[in-house]
Interface confidence: low
């Protein structure tokens, strides 16, 4: 064997978001014919020499980060990606509301507000059937999730959780579901918005609130699939990566510019008409990557 053995995968079934009192099984999956599996919990260090861990009744102490590896002969594999096992229902459920309304005309803005018993500084928003979550660390006891330029893809059922950054694996119960309905086209979709029309989050409007970037989120893994209680579709809790989103927007912008440059080769008259139309589109901010 040259080089380390490939890493196994570690999954929680049925979900890595586990309500207190419910059961969960962690399963480590490596290649066939493995000599030994090791499944370990980090902080505090505990391990089992088997390929699964059955937790019959989820407790606060079970929540945390897990990983696994396996041994073939004298060789150990690379460790799996870490799995975060979250205990939910530890705190009272937050409430989730949409402002100005849960029925939003396409092209308009909406803010989903997750409000919890005060002083939770982390909030997570999930959309049913989605593969990611939208996480916004914020001081105080509410979190705003602005969705700019709503599209049909934003329609759906949302739930949020709250938790304290000091106990990142102990979450609230899920909020009651909020159904976001995207209605027909906005009255003036081609209007160039002024700066005032962009939603501003509370933390940017009122600098007295503790800045949102004080909470480190570097340890959060990106590849875990989970299925919060009450929701059947698979979920994940990867962060929104704004930098990644911006990169995509830049690429889209560059593509549009290349297309515009290609138009120069065309007849002057048609180019002029086309350019006018496209420049109006460019002046509108590009919508963020769809949440769905």
């Amino acid at each position: 064997q040259s080089g380390p053995l490939p890493k196994p995968s570690l999954q929680a079934q049925p979900s890595s978001l586990v309500p207190l009192g419910q059961s969960v099984i962690l399963r480590c999956q490596g290649p066939p014919d493995v000599d030994l599996y090791r499944l370990e919990k980090l902080k505090p260090e505990k391990y089992e020499d088997q390929d699964f861990l059955f937790i019959p009744t989820m407790e606060r102490s079970n929540a945390g980060r897990y990983r696994c590896s396996y041994q073939n002969g004298s060789h150990w594999s690379l460790p799996s990606d870490q799995l975060e096992l979250i205990a939910t229902g530890v705190y009272a459920k937050p409430s989730l509301s949409a402002h100005p309304s849960s029925a939003v005309p396409q092209g308009r803005d909406v803010t989903l507000k997750c409000q919890s018993p005060y002083s939770f500084d982390e909030f997570v928003l999930y959309k049913e059937g989605d593969t990611g979550s939208y996480k916004r660390p914020e001081k105080w006891y509410r979190a705003n999730f602005p969705i700019i330029t709503v599209t049909a893809a934003h329609s759906g059922t949302y739930r949020c959780y709250s938790f304290s950054s000091s106990s990142p694996y102990l979450w609230s119960a899920p909020s009651d579901p909020l159904v976001l309905v995207v209605t027909g086209l906005s009255a003036t979709p081609s209007q160039v918005p002024t700066e005032e029309s962009f939603p501003v989050t509370e933390s940017s409007r009122r600098p007295s609130i503790l800045p949102t970037n004080k909470i480190s989120t570097t340890e959060k893994p990106m590849n875990i699939t989970a299925s919060p209680e009450g929701l059947s579709p698979p979920f994940g809790f990867a962060h929104q990566h704004y930098a990644k989103g911006n990169l995509v927007r830049i690429c889209l912008g560059a593509t549009i510019i290349i297309i515009l440059l290609g138009l120069l080769a065309e007849d002057w008259h048609s180019r002029k008409k086309c350019l006018q139309h496209r420049m109006r589109a460019l002046q509108r901010p590009l919508p963020p990557l769809p949440l769905a």
């Epitope: 009272a92 005060y118 002083s119």
Partner: antibody, heavy 121, light 111 residues
Framework: QVQLVQSGAEVKKPGASVKVSCKAS????????MHWVRQAPGQGLEWMGL????????EYAQRFQGRVTMTRDTSTSTVYMELSSLRSEDTAVYYC??????????????WGQGTLVTVSS | QSVLTQPPSVSAAPGQKVTISCSGS????????VSWYQQLPGTAPKLLIY???KRPSGIPDRFSGSKSGTSATLGITGLQTEDEADYYC???????????FGGGTKLTVLG
């Protein structure tokens, strides 16, 4: 020991404002939310709002919104509650109360002695 | 009109047991933590029970709290004359973003 000491009784005319102070001692002032609760004569307790002392962030009960202002001075470990446009029904004992937890709302573990505000023409 | 509902008064003889009920809804008691306060005549309220059933240090174990669904109960055993006071329940209401209190229950110790 941990205590909250409030300013003395006030008599105000309708339409005026009153500012009540609450000085905290015996604990780290910025580590607990502070609430204001009032009690009209012979009546029950009514929550007015809270202030987060380290940032000065506030949350007011909707019925006091626009009339109440809560501030704090970290250098003197004092919180203030100002109520404007006073009416006779604002006659009450006003209490400051410390939140027992920072993580979730468990209760008010320390109370000031109360400040009687009388609104009368 | 208080958001949480308590009986206006209860009474019992010294040494007896008494319970005070507090009824709310899913947005307060049902999904949050109940606390209980004792207010002796002419004094500020004092925390008796927090987090549904926990006693702060210094509160005798004669006082107990419980919660079921959207209702909570304060129990006092071995009643003493000094227990004569007003008792209030409270909880955070996440729908209205405020603390809500019961109307208070006057406990009379007979005899």
């Amino acid at each position: 020991q941990v205590q909250l000491v409030q300013s003395g009784a006030e008599v105000k005319k309708p339409g005026a404002s009153v500012k009540v102070s609450c000085k905290a001692s015996g604990y780290t002032f910025t580590s607990h939310y502070m609430h204001w609760v009032r009690q009209a004569p012979g009546q029950g307790l009514e929550w007015m709002g809270l202030i987060e002392p380290s940032e000065g962030e506030t949350e007011y009960a909707q019925r006091f919104q626009g009339r109440v202002t809560m501030t704090r001075d970290t250098s003197t470990s004092t919180v203030y509650m100002e109520l404007s446009s006073l009416r006779s029904e604002d006659t009450a004992v006003y209490y400051c109360a410390r939140d027992s937890s920072r993580s979730y709302p468990l209760g008010f573990d320390i109370w000031g002695q109360g400040t009687l505000v009388t609104v009368s023409s | 009109q208080s958001v949480l509902t308590q009986p206006p008064s209860v009474s019992a003889a010294p040494g007896q047991k008494v319970t005070i009920s507090c009824s709310g809804s899913s947005s307060n008691i049902g999904n949050n933590y109940v606390s209980w306060y004792q207010q002796l005549p002419g004094t500020a309220p004092k925390l008796l029970i927090y987090d549904n059933n926990k006693r702060p240090s210094g509160i005798p174990d004669r006082f107990s709290g419980s919660k079921s669904g959207t209702s909570a109960t304060l129990g006092i055993t071995g009643l003493q004359t000094e227990d004569e006071a007003d008792y209030y329940c409270a909880a955070w209401d996440f729908r209205s973003s405020r603390w809500v209190f019961g109307g208070g229950t006057k406990l009379t110790v007979l005899g």
